[in-house]
Amino acid sequence: HTAAQDNCTCPTNKMTVCSPDGPGGRCQCRALGSGMAVDCSTLTSKCLLLKARMSAPKNARTLVRPSEHALVDNDGLYDPDCDPEGRFKARQCNQTSVCWCVNSVGVRRTDKGDLSLRCDELVRTHHILIDLRHRPTAGAFNHSDLDAELRRLFRERYRLHPKFVAAVHYEQPTIQIELRQNTSQKAAGDVDIGDAAYYFERDIKGESLFQGRGGLDLRVRGEPLQVERTLIYYLDEIPPKFSMKRLT
């Protein structure tokens, strides 16, 4: 499950360049854009993935901007600054010196300001609500079967421990997946819920980040689950700080 030795590729991140120049001639993979070494046995951080996405040549980008329906991440794509561990830096700025603070999933959580803006800490997103609407089917899915398949998907495809899948709600045609992971719950080696949600979001859009693995084929008792829209809501451990003007 690490970088594949035989053909030296990264199973968990196609946005990498790999070569057998690691210790002992082992396959080592680096993320496009940042050049940072990535652990191919687990998900790559969302920050490095966004950076790689922005660095890809425009004509080679088979990926699309997040749809305008996204309610929370409505700033869309940007070229983020990542720390040496691949996490988002708390303060992000663009080329015109406009700056803002982000949470651990890279979503803006303050008004935009200038270079004097201070972001004291990276605030953790501890609760993610993934809201899906599935295409019409002959009948509703069985809730417990749907619950089981989605928990298994997050465990087996995204390597997210089932204890972080707080709940799966279903009222046809809406499915809600709740991911919860406090700072104190996340142990070394645990996949971050933000990274799992991002991989899932890209899978749902048909833009799988996995190398050589088939696209997402989600079935419940053999019946295909086809998603026609996705909304993702992020809740931070510390509430965001927006001015009243933005809220009106």
Epitope: H1, T2, P11, S144, D147, A148, E149, R151, R152, R155, E156, R159, L160, H161, P162, K163, V165, G189, V191, R213
Partner: antibody, heavy 118, light 109 residues
Framework: QSLEESGGDLVQPGASLTLTCKAS????????MLWVRQAPGKGLEWIGC???????TYFASWATGRFAISKTSSTTVTLQMTSLTAADTATYFC?????????????WGPGTLVTVSS | YDMTQTPASVSAAVGGTVTIKCQAS??????LAWYQQKPGQPPKLLIY???DLASGVPSRFKGSGSGTEYTLTISDLECDDAATYYC????????????FGGGTEVVVK
């Protein structure tokens, strides 16, 4: 840390039986619990699994419908079996995964013997 | 995800080497374990992630492979290595008949 199965018995064909797996020394909620069986002189056969957090269950294709797994207390998991036949005669093991997201079984009970015979 | 294990039985002298192969019907991304089982006992985890030794397992046991092809090699055989060995795919529990291979009996002469 340990696991111990109980409830194995000699039963008639067509009967039902519930096996219990008792866990000691660890928090079940951080793990998946699996049941595996082994017929006399045969290999290991995976039956099913429960994700303790969430309570979702998964079964080998041959076991779906006739077997059920549930968490019955903070330290016990059960395997319910119905419509038993001679082919179900085996030692039944409960096992725990290693707490990661793979299904490596690093803790096993000693097993309990189920004999189905008239 | 069927697991095919060969051979069913293998015999070697003390100090010798045995090789057991396991083939998965689909790519399991190196999520493979090897277990040792002795009569009257539950299986014991030897190797995980295809090549990593479980705690307390001697380095005479070596796992290798990727994709669909995996191998367990036991070198410098000891009498205590006489047992049945099983491979297990640890990638998925969805739509499978059995996660385990059929087993290989190792006889030490």
């Amino acid at each position: 840390q340990s696991l111990e199965e109980s409830g194995g018995d000699l039963v008639q064909p067509g009967a039902s039986l519930t096996l219990t797996c008792k866990a000691s020394g660890f928090d079940l909620n951080n793990y998946a619990m699996l049941w595996v069986r082994q017929a006399p002189g045969k290999g290991l056969e995976w039956i099913g699994c429960i994700y303790i957090s969430g309570g979702t269950t998964y079964f080998a294709s041959w076991a779906t419908g006739r077997f059920a797994i549930s968490k019955t207390s903070s330290t016990t998991v059960t395997l319910q079996m119905t419509s038993l036949t001679a082919a179900d005669t085996a030692t039944y093991f409960c096992a725990r995964d290693d707490g990661t997201t793979s299904y490596y079984l690093n803790l096993w009970g000693p097993g309990t013997l189920v004999t189905v015979s008239s | 995800y069927d697991m095919t294990q060969t051979p069913a039985s293998v015999s070697a002298a003390v100090g010798g080497t045995v090789t057991i192969k396991c083939q998965a019907s689909e790519d399991i991304y190196s999520l493979l374990a090897w277990y040792q089982q002795k009569p009257g006992q539950p299986p014991k985890l030897l190797i995980y992630d295809a090549s990593d030794l479980a705690s307390g397992v001697p380095s005479r046991f070596k796992g290798s492979g990727s994709g669909t092809e995996y191998t367990l090699t036991i070198s410098d055989l000891e009498c205590d290595d006489a047992a049945t060995y099983y491979c297990q795919q640890a990638y998925t529990i969805g739509n499978i008949d059995n996660a385990f291979g059929g087993g290989t009996e190792v006889v030490v002469k």
